[in-house]
Interface confidence: low
Amino acid sequence: LEVSESPGSIQVARGQPAVLPCTFTTSAALINLNVIWMVTPLSNANQPEQVILYQGGQMFDGAPRFHGRVGFTGTMPATNVSIFINNTQLSDTGTYQCLVNNLPDIGGRNIGVTGLTVLVPPSAPHCQIQGSQDIGSDVILLCSSEEGIPRPTYLWEKLDNTLKLPPTATQDQVQGTVTIRNISALSSGLYQCVASNAIGTSTCLLDLQVISPQPRNIG
């Protein structure tokens, strides 16, 4: 018995279906086919769980969180024992193993391994200003999304004709911050943060209004 090598890792957007491949060759009839799919969740590597089982000609549910979402892609028994997972959740991310036994065919590699990563687009980021907006001050524009896998990067731009940040600005696309030093009237305007990752983008807007000092009355 020989389980074919998996293509490696699979990525899928949250909520979408995933197909985890597992095929094998065998010299025996599929009368005593035994298949166990296991997952070692990324979120809890110490607690492997059963996903779905095929034993004695019957299919069995694994862990309750997979009930109703998992099945074999084809009619069993078969040498293609790939499974689908519908409505993928973040908690489905992990390393999946198919363990195949088909007596009396013993020996060879009877385990296939596939990684599954459930991707999440960035949630609507939160934009805010830190610091005084008085002319000559330093301000920090902050941008962060609560959700996003892979971790989003953040790009700030000023919504004027150039889409460029003021020359006194420095940007950190990982942290989502822009520091603008010595703000002036020219710093005023609408700023947009674009949070993006492999499967999506999301934006928020911020209105920076630099406050000019009030003229002093001479009397």
Epitope: M38, P48, E49, Q50, Q55, Q58, P64, G68
Partner: antibody, heavy 127, light 108 residues
Framework: EVQLLESGGGLVQPGGSLRLSCAAS????????MSWVRQAPGKGLEWVSA????????YYADSVKGRFTISRDNSKNTLYLQMNSLRAEDTAVYYC????????????????????WGRGTLVTVSS | SYELTQPPSVSVSPGQTASITCSGD??????ASWYQQKPGQSPVLVIY???KRPSGIPERFSGSNSGNTATLTISGTQAEDEADYYC???????????FGGGTKLTVL
């Protein structure tokens, strides 16, 4: 209130059929496996059958396999047990029980326990 | 088929410790649960996964499981603990429950 309420029991002749129902309330029915456990008069508990939360998997004791069918309607929060070819030894109080199934690991099967029970319904098989 | 053996009866004085045993082949390799059933009532889960107590079950109920024997221990036994007690294990996911024959606990 979290509860299970069985119905459908009664007197039936040997070889006859009966359908038991169990109405669940107070919890998310579709998230739980469910089971039937019976108790003959003056005797101990005997597990009869179980069904997964989705209804995709069913399990039976050898003593009822081929005669009893467990099913569920998640839209109605109801569990069923269709009992055919009834025998005198099937006479018992039939309890509906919520089954917790905890997944096994690579080296062990999962295990079951029953954390919520109904009041039971009596099935008498006699001529 | 897998069998669980329990003593038919156990007696204990109020305030003393009662131990009810359940034996089966390599029982320690499986998880045991215990149920209490009072006359005319349905069973109540008192211990699961060998030693875990559901909410609402008094702390005087405890459980252990090793080798071929699982044990339910009731410390400071009270009159209200008088009941039948059943142990239960799974033979695997395909067989949800194997119950012991039950033990009648009498509080003298």
């Amino acid at each position: 209130e979290v509860q299970l309420l069985e119905s459908g029991g009664g007197l039936v002749q040997p070889g006859g059929s009966l359908r038991l129902s169990c109405a669940a309330s107070g919890f998310t029915f579709s998230s739980y496996a469910m089971s039937w456990v019976r108790q003959a008069p003056g005797k101990g508990l005997e597990w009869v059958s179980a069904i997964s939360g989705s209804g995709g998997s069913t399990y039976y004791a050898d003593s009822v396999k081929g005669r009893f069918t467990i099913s569920r309607d998640n839209s109605k929060n109801t569990l069923y047990l269709q009992m055919n070819s009834l025998r005198a030894e099937d006479t018992a109080v039939y309890y509906c029980a919520r089954g917790q199934y905890v997944s096994g690991t690579y080296y062990s099967y999962g295990y079951w326990y029953f954390d919520l029970w109904g009041r039971g319904t009596l099935v008498t098989v006699s001529s | 088929s897998y069998e669980l053996t329990q003593p038919p009866s156990v007696s204990v004085s109020p305030g003393q410790t009662a131990s009810i045993t359940c034996s089966g082949d390599k029982l320690g390799d499986k998880y045991a649960s215990w149920y209490q059933q009072k006359p005319g009532q349905s069973p109540v889960l008192v211990i699961y996964q060998d030693s875990k107590r559901p909410s609402g079950i008094p702390e005087r109920f405890s459980g252990s499981n090793s080798g071929n024997t699982a044990t339910l221990t009731i410390s400071g036994t009270q009159a209200e603990d008088e009941a039948d007690y059943y142990c239960q294990v799974s033979r695997g996911h395909t067989s949800a429950g194997v119950f012991g024959g039950g033990t009648k606990l009498t509080v003298l």
